[in-house]
């Protein structure tokens, strides 16, 4: 069963989350792509995606987020910026595929934004940054409005094989670990 | 500790195809990007592309699409680079090495297997 | 792709040395650059990432600075076991690259 799980980030304000979603090449390279928080009771909410059909290593930049999509590797790769501690919260990457339900991407992303200047770099695992030159050729791209009732967090149903899949349901595993994200100073 | 353990050297002849195997130890092998890296004899290292072993997911260089996979078997902890069409140009040292948290913009190899030597001769 | 090129190619110094390589970035690359050392016959090993932390384990006698498109990677007191071949690598945007390495051979 793909269990869906939940990975949580630390960071203070002003710094940039820097993740990557991973997926399959073959099947979703030009897909249009989105970034999304989910709110405990409520359906995700789509702050930004990529063009449609996505670019090739193309920025494209909301506000805050910058997303770049990177076909030939199988990863979507997004920024958000300059953190205030109001960012904090559960985010996910999902694929549109309409007429289909979007297609979530594990892992979803916990996180915790904390006020207060950071401290020396942790473990080389994660690198992360507080300042981000923003590409001065980045776009802003149209989201579809649809979102999946299936995603509310309320009620996560059970996992199967392809959460795809209209009947496909997640179950989120508890989040053990807390990574403490080096930072740039 | 940290291990990454490569097979053996290998010499085949142009056209054949060469599957390399990498098998990890001392952590979460799902939880890392493995990455593959190649060095021809006195030449500099070029990254080949990398895969995310939780789910299966790969990326290439251009310049390899088409002739390399990047695969797993998770219950064994251990991942494959295979190379197909080999020509002369191929014959180098493979390295797997380990990367950043999978979920994680990070490409920082901070273990990497002992590198396997590939020979394509005819 | 983003070009890295690594200056000199290669030196030679006593030991005691104060040893300095510079990796430039075709384009700003932020501070996405990593420092490998190999010895020959040998598989890199992670001296520094991030442009400027030290990998778990190595002497403090390596260090990195630099941001943007110059990078600067320094051994302050070069010693016999240093002999070796010195890459850098970025990664703020794919392909991953690596700069054609710097060989430091003792005087």
């Known amino acids: 069963a793909t269990k869906l799980t939940e990975e949580k980030y630390e960071l203070k304000e002003g710094q940039t989350l820097d993740v990557k979603c991973d997926y399959t090449l073959e099947k979703f390279a030009s897909s249009q792509k989105a970034w999304q928080i989910i709110r405990d009771g409520e359906m995700p909410k789509t702050l930004a995606c990529t063009e449609r059909p996505s670019k090739n290593s193309h920025p494209v930049q909301v506000g805050r987020i910058i997303l770049e999509d990177y076909h030939d590797h199988g990863l979507l790769r997004v920024r958000m910026v300059n953190l205030q501690v109001e960012d904090s919260g559960l985010y996910q990457c999902v694929i549109y595929q309409p007429p289909k339900e979007p297609h979530m991407l594990f892992d979803r992303i916990r996180l915790v934004v904390t006020k207060g200047f950071s401290g020396t770099p942790g473990s080389n695992e994660n690198s992360t940054q507080n300042v981000y030159k923003i590409p001065p050729t980045t776009t802003k791209a149209l989201c579809p409005l649809y979102t999946s009732p299936r995603t509310v967090t309320q009620a996560p149903p059970k996992s199967t094989a392809d959460v795809s899949t209209p009947d496909s349901e997640i179950n989120l595993t508890n989040v053990t670990d807390i990574i403490r994200v080096p930072v740039f100073n | 500790q940290v291990q990454l353990v490569q097979s053996g050297a290998e010499v085949k002849k142009p056209g054949a195809s060469v599957k390399v195997s990498c098998k990890a130890s001392?952590?979460?092998?799902?939880?890392?990007?493995i990455n593959w890296v190649r060095q021809a004899t006195g030449q500099g290292l070029e990254w080949m592309g990398r895969m995310n072993p939780k789910s299966g997911n790969a990326g290439y260089v251009q310049n390899f699409r088409g002739r390399v996979t990047m695969t797993r078997n998770t219950s064994i902890s251990t991942a494959y680079m295979e190379l197909s069409s080999l020509r002369s140009e191929d014959t180098a040292v493979y390295y797997c090495?380990?990367?950043?948290?999978?979920?994680?913009?990070?490409?920082?190899?901070?273990?990497w297997g002992q590198g396997t030597l590939v020979t394509v001769s005819s | 792709d983003i070009q890295m090129t690594q200056s000199p190619s290669s030196l030679s110094a006593s030991v005691g040395d104060r040893v300095t390589i510079t990796c430039q970035a075709s384009?700003?690359?932020?501070?996405?650059l990593n420092w490998y050392q190999q010895k020959p016959g040998k598989a890199p090993k992670l001296l520094i990432y991030?442009?400027?932390n030290l990998e778990t384990g190595v002497p403090s006698r390596f260090s990195g600075s630099g941001s943007g498109t110059d990078f600067t990677f320094t051994i302050s007191s070069l010693q016999p076991e240093d002999i070796a071949t010195y890459n850098c690598q970025q990664y703020d945007k794919l392909p991953l690259t690596f700069g054609g390495g710097t060989k430091v051979e003792i005087k």
């Open positions: 991030d442009t400027s």
């Open positions: 384009q700003d690359i932020s501070k996405h």
């Open positions: 001392g952590y979460t092998f799902t939880s890392y990007d």
């Open positions: 090495a380990r990367g950043g948290r999978t979920s994680i913009w990070s490409f920082v190899f901070d273990y």
